[in-house]
């Protein structure tokens, strides 16, 4: 059939909860392409009916929820004007009850379910939740050894759990939990994460570089919506946190009640030698009190700010 085969690494997943996999393979999927999902070399495509437990949602295959019998090799076929690629994804489903210690250890989990905290540093864990836009995720709760995490050293920020002054006691088994809503139905997502610790700096003490902003002011009209990106380059296995603060407080905490100013979800692009991270700040409505206040982007020890400024009056 003239399609080039590409084999992705195995994904190991937990039964009885939602799972989604996006068929993206840059640069193949960057142009005008059609994507079709199949299971186990079947000639019949995966359903696109949103009521189906397993269905294709744009470029994604979505399981609501995943079941033990869903293990197998799935193919997505990406057809462009002059090209065809078939991507093979091996999904292995296992039954795991995170808090049942009588059940043996986990299988060889994907790397995102194994994370490392750096002793004595401020660090973070990430809850990897990859779902299409049709899935709405609620706030994330974090657990350690099956107990909900509380305490002033821990802060939940979007999909991350910030851990300040990491200690040896922070190692162990964690889980992040969110409620996913799709077509009016709710599902629980629970990701287990094994967390180990190290004293190694890992990234050699490198300092992240904030590309933008550059400690400058931005002219913006009162009442408008404003989104500002903070772009940071850093080494691949850095442990630096990236966030927006005002008055030395995380913006999501500072505007906790009104939610008028929020930090966006961090994204990153991976290059050979470094990563480029983007985390934005959204002003739903700029108010007078926002002017003249430094909004700080933090990335490890690096900081840069923007100051909102009223546009100069136009006397023309």
């Amino acid at each position: 059939d003239g399609c080039k085969d590409i084999f992705m690494k195995n994904e190991i997943l937990s039964a009885s909860q939602p799972f989604a996999f996006n068929c993206t393979f840059p640069p193949i999927t960057s142009g005008e392409v059609s994507v079709t999902w199949y299971k186990n070399s079947s000639k019949i495509p995966v359903s696109k009916i949103i009521q189906s437990r397993i269905h294709q949602d744009e470029t994604w295959i979505l399981f609501l929820p995943m079941e033990w019998g869903d293990s197998g090799v799935y193919q997505c076929v990406i057809k462009g004007r002059d090209s065809c690629h078939r991507i093979h994804v091996n999904l292995t489903v296992f039954e795991k009850h995170w808090c049942d210690t009588s059940i043996g250890g986990l299988p060889n989990l994907s790397d995102e379910y194994k994370q490392i905290l750096h002793l004595g540093k401020d660090d973070s864990l990430t809850c990897h939740l990859h779902f299409p836009k049709s899935c709405v995720l609620g706030p994330i709760k974090w657990y350690k050894d099956c107990n909900e995490i509380k305490g002033e050293r821990f802060t939940v920020l979007e999909t991350r759990l910030l851990v300040s002054n990491v200690s040896a006691e922070d190692r162990g088994n964690y889980a992040c939990q969110a409620i996913l809503t799709h077509s009016g139905k709710q599902y629980e997502v629970l990701n287990g994460i094994t967390v180990s610790i190290t004293e190694r700096a890992g990234y050699g003490g490198s300092v992240p570089k904030i590309i933008y902003p550059k400690n400058h002011s931005i002219e913006v009209q009162l009442g408008t919506t404003l989104i500002v990106d903070c772009n940071v380059t850093d080494t691949k296995d850095n442990t630096n946190l990236r966030c927006w603060r005002v008055n030395n407080t995380l913006v999501d905490d500072y505007y906790d009640e009104s939610k008028r100013i929020r930090e966006g979800v961090e994204t990153h692009v991976s290059f050979r030698e470094h990563n480029l991270y983007t985390v934005n700040i959204t002003f739903l409505e700029v108010k007078m009190e926002d002017y003249g206040l430094p909004f700080m982007c933090h990335a490890g020890v690096s900081t840069a700010y923007i100051i909102l400024q009223l546009p100069a009056p136009d006397f023309r």
């Epitope: 060889n108 790397d111 490392i116 040896a168 162990g172 094994t194 004293e199 190694r200 990234y203 080494t235």
Partner: antibody, heavy 120, light 106 residues
Framework: QVQLQESGPGLVKPSQTLSLTCTVS??????GYWNWIRNHPGKGLEYI?????????YYNPSLKSRVTISRDTSKNQFSLKLSSVTAADTAVYYC??????????????WGQGTLVTVSS | DIQMTQSPSSLSASVGDRVTITCRAS?????MYWYQQKPGKAPKLWIY???NLASGVPSRFSGSGSGTSYTLTISSLQPEDFATYYC?????????FGQGTKLEIK
């Protein structure tokens, strides 16, 4: 059970490059830290360096100009190259990894070691 | 670099003796790791995070210390304990080992 196995020539000529490979089973080298350590005859242990889960490498500054650690994730192997060797590089070379009790720095799993002699 | 100095360098002792090996760091370290090595064998993790015994290590071994001074203690020496012991730190690179303490039968 994690197992590590060193392989490579046991004899290297002075000024040449020492090359060793560590083959890993029971764990993926895309998690954790993968270390090289050597033991000079009748002397102590010397830390050479590591390659991390992301491919980041760290080298002991005393060897940095001569050492390269790399990996092949498809074969689940990582390698050591030490250039311009002299008799002082004669040692038993070990690969090792940690992760014991969720502590990456606790080197619990070791290869059996391979003796490399530098001699003409 | 943090220099790790073990004392004594060698020690002759008898079965049943209480033995203490000291590791002094030239600067503060957060945790100490100890390894046991027997001739012709790879080192074995013995004590991690200063005071935790690795799997299979007898309870007669203990580890303690903080800052620049750390100790490995054997409460009652047994024949299988005769070996060389190394301390190691990861607080500051390079990740240095002590020169080793060789424990011999008197």
């Amino acid at each position: 059970q994690v197992q590590l196995q060193e392989s490579g020539p046991g004899l290297v000529k002075p000024s040449q490059t020492l090359s060793l490979t560590c083959t890993v089973s029971g764990a993926s080298i895309t998690s954790g830290y993968w270390n090289w350590i050597r033991n000079h005859p009748g002397k102590g242990l010397e830390y050479i360096g590591y390659i991390s889960y992301s491919g980041y490498t760290y080298y002991n500054p005393s060897l940095k100009s001569r050492v390269t650690i790399s990996r092949d994730t498809s074969k689940n192997q990582f390698s050591l190259k030490l250039s311009s060797v002299t008799a002082a590089d004669t040692a038993v070379y070990y690969c090792a990894t940690g992760g014991y009790d969720y502590v990456e720095d606790a080197l619990y799993y070791w290869g059996q070691g391979t003796l490399v002699t530098v001699s003409s | 670099d943090i220099q790790m100095t073990q004392s004594p360098s060698s020690l002759s002792a008898s079965v049943g003796d209480r033995v203490t090996i000291t590791c002094r760091a030239s600067s503060n370290v957060r945790y100490m790791y100890w390894y046991q090595q027997k001739p012709g064998k790879a080192p074995k993790l013995w004590i991690y995070l200063t005071s935790n015994l690795a799997s299979g290590v007898p309870s007669r071994f203990s580890g303690s210390g903080s800052g620049t001074s750390y100790t490995l203690t054997i409460s009652s020496l047994q024949p299988e304990d005769f070996a060389t012991y190394y301390c190691q730190q990861y607080t500051t690179s390079p990740y240095t080992f002590g020169q080793g303490t060789k424990l011999e039968i008197k």
